[in-house]
């Protein structure tokens, strides 16, 4: 299996944005790559977002996706937006080298994203 590296822990910003790098050790000369972000929480795995891109080009997520990203060589910089405390969990980067054959699959160990909801601003009386 292809090796995929990602950071162990990331803290989301107060605006609910978390960014991390997913890096894969490409054993072949892929031209088309698919990146999928999976969330594992309470032994349940769900797909957060996915994008297919041509090497050297931008990642294209669906319009309603909470993810954005850029690619550079064998690195993908992923950003997940709109996170809330309940979204805290392990976010796994899955990379597939689709074309040309052969197919390679790599799954990272996951990045634990901690999301802390901001404290509401206290009402002020002037």
């Amino acid at each position: 299996a292809m090796h995929v590296a990602q950071p162990a822990v990331v803290l989301a910003s107060s605006r609910g944005i978390a960014s991390f790098v997913c890096e894969y050790a490409s054993p072949g000369k892929a031209t088309e790559v698919r990146v999928t972000v999976l969330r594992q929480a309470d032994s349940q795995v769900t797909e957060v977002c996915a994008a297919t891109y041509m090497m050297g080009n931008e990642l294209t997520f669906l319009d309603d996706s909470i993810c954005t990203g850029t690619s550079s060589g064998n690195q993908v910089n992923l950003t997940i937006q709109g996170l809330r405390a309940m979204d805290t969990g392990l976010y796994i980067c899955k990379v597939e080298l689709m074309y040309p054959p052969p197919y390679y699959l790599g799954i990272g160990n996951g990045t634990q994203i901690y999301v802390i909801d901001p404290e509401p601003c206290p009402d002020s009386d002037f």
């Epitope: 031209t31 088309e32 297919t52 891109y53 689709m98 074309y99 040309p100 054959p101 052969p102 197919y103």
Partner: antibody, heavy 118, light 107 residues
Framework: EVQLVESGGGLVKPGGSLRLSCAAS????????MAWVRQAPGKGLEWVAF????????YYADTETGRFTISRDNAKNSLYLQMNSLRAEDTAVYYC???????????WGQGTTVTVSS | DIQMTQSPSSLSASVGDRVTITCRAS??????LNWYQQKPGKTVKLLIY???RLHSGVPSRFSGSGSGTDFTLTISSLQPEDVATYFC?????????FGGGTKVEIK
């Protein structure tokens, strides 16, 4: 139910052109790579061309490179094969097939016959 | 290109017989070996992918095995509806290539 229906085949003179079409239904077309495979009379199967789901990747058999062009219109659930400079040896039944598993073709159409003859 | 050699090119067996078809690749194709069935005058159907995985709706009497360069398609108990030509195909490298086919008939 997955359905693939080819059309556009016919009799053409050497050096002529044809455009084959494949209408897909019963699945989300834009999620799948698609291929054209041909079968000459009484012969085996020969892969012709492949296009990935978003048309990022396109590949051809060596003998077809430069003469054939595979394309797709995901909005119309359609696959195409533009064939130029046709030769007698291009005479075959042309099948469109879905690449539902990496590098395997899991559903095939009934085929459309192309005859190149003077 | 990777050459795929199938044998035998044709065979005749009785209903209930165990039938074996072999496919040899000219180089290692890992697990990217698929088997297809084409009944007379009909289209092509995927039977087995990744050496041994049955495609949906395929009867369990069909099975696949092998590794590297040598692969086998087995019909454990031949049925009249299995009369067809069977093709192997490699998906390891482009161009994707097929075996020459094995025509299976009933005695």
């Amino acid at each position: 139910e997955v359905q693939l229906v080819e059309s556009g085949g016919g009799l053409v003179k050497p050096g002529g052109s044809l455009r084959l079409s494949c209408a897909a239904s019963g699945f989300t077309f834009s999620d799948y790579g698609m291929a054209w495979v041909r079968q000459a009379p009484g012969k085996g199967l020969e892969w012709v061309a492949f296009i990935s789901n978003l048309a990022y990747s396109v590949y051809y058999a060596d003998t077809e490179t430069g003469r054939f062009t595979i394309s797709r219109d995901n909005a119309k659930n359609s696959l195409y094969l533009q064939m130029n400079s046709l030769r007698a040896e291009d005479t075959a039944v042309y099948y469109c097939a879905r690449s539902g598993l990496p590098y395997a073709m899991d559903y095939w159409g009934q085929g459309t016959t192309v005859t190149v003859s003077s | 290109d990777i050459q795929m050699t199938q044998s035998p090119s044709s065979l005749s067996a009785s209903v209930g017989d165990r039938v074996t078809i072999t496919c040899r690749a000219s180089q290692d194709i890992s697990n990217y070996l698929n088997w297809y069935q084409q009944k007379p005058g009909k289209t092509v159907k995927l039977l087995i992918y990744y050496i041994s995985r049955l495609h949906s709706g395929v009867p369990s009497r069909f099975s696949g095995s092998g590794s590297g360069t040598d692969f086998t398609l087995t019909i454990s108990s031949l049925q009249p509806e299995d009369v067809a030509t069977y093709f192997c195909q490699q998906g390891r490298m482009l161009p994707w290539t097929f075996g020459g086919g094995t025509k299976v008939e009933i005695k």
